[in-house]
Amino acid sequence: MSITGISPITEYLASLSTYNDQSITFALEDESYEIYVEDLKKDEKKDKVLLSYYESQHPSNESGDGVDGKMLMVTLSPTKDFWLHANNKEHSVELHKSEKPLPDQAFFVLHNMHSNSVSFESKTDPGVFIGVKDNHLALIKVDSSENLSTENILFKLSETHHHHHH
């Protein structure tokens, strides 16, 4: 899977929540960021994430559609210079400071269940998705026989009118 352009085709500012309407939040602790999945109080402000969309070609052996075989890849950045990364060895999702060009671990294939319900598949480990485990984000293997609608890998994107804090 190769990214076809250096620049994102679009960027989208959203808050991220689970299928069960828990919010994904980010907290700076001891000079590193922690990611939490939690219920927010009624008027508590949701954290915002900058989703950058990139086009990517299917590997040629995977798709018979030539130039048509495109996917959407996303990177997720909750704050300046930090991006969500897949740690495939630890099956964890972590926030790391990175410089562009971003490593492959920062890219996720976007799957839509509907326009505001999405899943994020690790670019570096196909079949493994960002999911919720014990109130944290983790990498979860989804068998091809399973329906991707399994709730713990589904996330909702809700629009926000605030500016990203980049």
Partner: antibody
């Protein structure tokens, strides 16, 4: 080359049924969302129904809910639209269309030539 | 449901003119918008996706812009072969088409 070929249109009486088929080629069918979009004579485009790549999620225009059913057979590269209890206002050219990106409902890139459905007594 | 409103309904311009078509959404659609061209008797053809990305094979005189609720398709120098109806299409929340703008040559 991407090709989408719709069949099954024709003249049908109100209250009757019709099943449209769309055979796809030139791309990995099972990776893509598929759509039915219609256009009444001389009018604009109207989204009718969508189905995700594995067929597990389907969506409908309110006015066709409960009457139309979208389905797909990934082994045969075909998407269907079963239309029951047809009304005169369903008269339109029905287009089959393909999602722009694998696994994604964002954007539509290729369309078939359409099949005309006329509902009239 | 999101409504899409295109203006004008009909646009008449001369060959070589710069032409601007408008599409307004009833809610913020976050740049999740395509533009299609439909010539008489033909299926629609994708011109622009995600607001401002030119589809492969489409002439560079076509461009798109916008954000939030307001979007624009521009033809920098109108050609006779551009006579068609142009539709915007949002996919941010469900799927909705605008009613179309018919472009004619004066």
């Amino acid at each position: 080359e991407v090709q989408l070929v719709e069949t099954g249109g024709g003249l049908v009486q109100p209250g009757r049924s019709l099943k449209l088929s769309c055979v796809a080629s030139g791309f990995t069918f099972s990776n893509y969302w598929m759509y039915w979009i219609r256009q009444a004579p001389g009018m604009g485009l109207e989204w009718v129904s969508s189905i995700n790549n594995d067929g597990g999620n389907t969506y409908y225009l309110d006015s066709v809910k409960g009457r139309f059913t979208i389905s797909r057979n990934n082994a045969e590269n075909t998407v269907y639209l079963q239309m029951n209890s047809l009304r005169s206002e369903d008269t339109a050219t029905y287009y089959c269309a393909k999602g722009h990106y694998s696994y994604s409902s964002y954007s539509i890139d290729y369309w078939g030539q359409g099949t005309l459905v006329t509902v009239s007594s | 449901d999101i409504q899409m409103t295109q203006s004008p309904s009909v646009l008449s311009a001369s060959v070589g003119d710069r032409v601007t078509l408008s599409c307004k959404a009833s809610h913020n659609i976050n740049k999740h918008l395509d533009w299609y061209q439909q010539k008489v008797g033909e299926a629609p053809k994708l011109l622009i996706y995600f607001t401002n990305n030119l589809q492969t094979g489409i002439p560079s005189r076509f461009s798109g812009s916008g954000s939030g609720t307001d979007y624009t398709l521009t033809i920098s120098s109108l050609q006779p072969e551009d006579v068609a109806t142009y539709f915007c299409f949002q996919y941010n929340s469900g799927w909705t088409f605008g009613q179309g703008t018919k472009v004619e040559i004066k």
